[in-house]
């Protein structure tokens, strides 16, 4: 007789996960000389041990310490660079400045990246079949928390001038239900973070409004200043102009307004 | 310096029991899975058993499954292996031995020689 | 059980090239076998050389390199050195449980 599997809104685990993030460890570590000390079956038990026979929408960051603490990693904390709803230009751009880092450049972020994972409570099986939706089934589940978990570490351990990458083709450019405006934002820590500094993407071709002006800037902005840290805001008009010249920044067209 | 030094080797009659220990020094113990190997005289190497960095995890080779023990105590930075119901088979210089998923084993003890025999 | 078969012997001029195969039961060897290589010298705890396929450890000598080869494991020796003569092994990892070759005993001529 099948045994009853509850049915979630959102997708399954991804399909492969726990040779995926083998594989993405072992080859992380490879990469990452300061990281070779890393044990990546150690990190793989850690993190099967934060959900597996757990019951998805009953996580808790205490479930993911273990992973935490074997993932430590330090990162400059004046080279961070945080993003909201437009992760593909903010990867791209620390690939070519290579000495920022967007939390899917550490080793846990880079792990988990893209993927979906849960268990099933009191049994040692991952949920291919569905996972819990944020929205319509519940927050607490395994990906919603790692994210959560990693991303306030990451915010927490920022110092000097954080730099975040918004979206300007979204209605919201700043949206406080993101992770970077209800975790990053509420976990940067004034005494070490002197300036939140935005660069908000441009999508159109000849969209040349000033979006820093927009009502939801003001709001991250009055959100930023409450919190006794000082905001800045850059427009880039040209995302692909911006790219271009993060990696020659010699040339000279690069003087004039990206 | 990395280093493991087994112990608790020695003569044992069939169906006796023995507890190996490896004691580690150089490296954060607690953070790293651990294996035995062991190696009959003459013959080739035979994996034992690993265990997880925190113990919450373990596996072991058919041919000793249900008689051998893996367990650790990270806050003595030491490795054991339990062998209850040893037959003569079981004799062999077992390693233990530092493993990073992916690198292999990549410091091994010198070994400690165990022999099963009436 | 899973069984990891090896060539018992090979036999290589010195300066001469010589290849080491690992072969799973359950299949062909793949990258997710995170295939492991070790020498071990009479009297010697084992040393690793290759880990993951074909990375070599920073104190393995460089005429050494692994691959995949026809749904197998392998070692290359490439230019081959008398002090090269040793047994070598082959290590699978299986979801947690791993599985040495029986071994290659490689003898080095003159």
């Known amino acids: 007789v099948p045994r009853w599997r509850q049915q979630w809104s959102g997708p399954g685990t991804t399909k492969r996960f726990p040779e995926t993030v083998l594989a993405r460890c072992v080859k992380y570590t490879e990469i990452h000389p300061e990281m070779r000390h890393v044990d990546c079956q150690s990190v793989w038990d850690a993190f099967k041990g934060a959900f597996i026979s757990k019951h998805p929408c009953n996580i808790t960051e205490e479930d993911y310490q273990p992973l935490m603490k074997l993932g430590t990693q330090t990162v400059p904390c004046n080279k961070i660079l945080l993003w909201s709803r437009i992760k593909d230009l903010a990867h791209q751009f620390t690939q070519v400045q290579r000495d920022m880092f967007t939390l899917e450049d550490t080793l846990l972020g880079y792990l988990a990246d893209d993927l979906t994972w849960c268990g099933e409570f009191n049994t040692s099986k991952i949920n291919y079949q569905s996972c819990p939706d944020w929205r319509k089934d519940c927050s607490n589940n395994p990906v919603s928390v790692f994210w959560k978990t990693v991303s306030r570490r990451f915010a927490e351990a920022a110092c000097d001038v954080v730099h975040v990458m918004l979206n300007g083709s979204r209605s919201k450019i700043f949206d406080k239900n993101s992770t970077f405006g209800s975790v990053e934002v509420h976990n940067l820590q004034p005494e070490k973070v002197q300036t939140l500094e935005a660069w908000v993407i441009h999508g159109g071709r000849e969209d040349s409004r000033d979006l820093c002006q927009d009502p939801t800037i003001k709001e991250l902005e009055s959100i930023i200043s409450k919190r006794n840290i000082q905001f800045s805001c850059k427009n880039i008009y040209r995302p692909d102009k911006f790219l271009q010249c993060v990696k020659n920044p010699e040339d000279s067209s690069c003087t004039s307004e990206i | 310096e990395v280093q493991l030094v087994e112990s608790g080797g020695g003569l044992v009659q069939p169906g006796r029991s023995l507890r190996l220990s490896c004691a580690a020094s150089?490296?954060?113990?607690?953070?790293?899975?651990m294996s035995w190997v062991r190696q009959a005289p003459g013959k080739g190497l035979e994996w034992v058993a690993v265990i997880s960095y925190d113990g919450s995890n373990k596996y072991y080779a058919d041919s000793v499954k249900g008689r051998f023990t893996i367990s650790r105590d990270n806050s003595k930075n030491t490795l054991y292996l339990q062998m209850n119901s040893l037959r003569a088979e079981d004799t062999a210089v077992y390693y233990c031995?530092?493993?990073?998923f992916g690198y292999g084993m990549d410091v091994w003890g010198q070994g400690t020689t165990v022999t099963v025999s009436s | 059980q899973t069984v990891v078969t090896q060539e018992p012997s090979l036999t290589v001029s010195p300066g001469g090239t010589v290849t080491l195969t690992c072969a799973s039961s359950?299949?062909?060897?793949?990258?997710?076998?995170?295939p492991c290589w070790f020498q071990q010298k009479p009297g010697h705890p084992p040393r690793a050389l290759v880990y993951?396929?074909?990375t070599i450890h920073s104190w393995t000598p460089a005429r050494f390199s692994g691959s995949l080869l026809g749904g197998k494991a392998a070692l290359t020796v490439s230019g081959v050195q008398p002090e090269d003569e040793a047994d070598y092994y082959c290590?699978?990892?299986?979801?947690?449980?791993?599985?040495f070759g029986g071994g290659t005993q490689l003898t080095v001529l003159g």
């Open positions: 359950t299949g062909a060897v793949t990258s997710d076998h995170y």
């Open positions: 031995a530092h493993l990073r």
């Open positions: 290590l699978l990892y299986y979801g947690g449980a791993r599985v």
């Open positions: 993951s396929t074909d």
């Open positions: 150089g490296f954060t113990f607690s953070s790293y899975a």
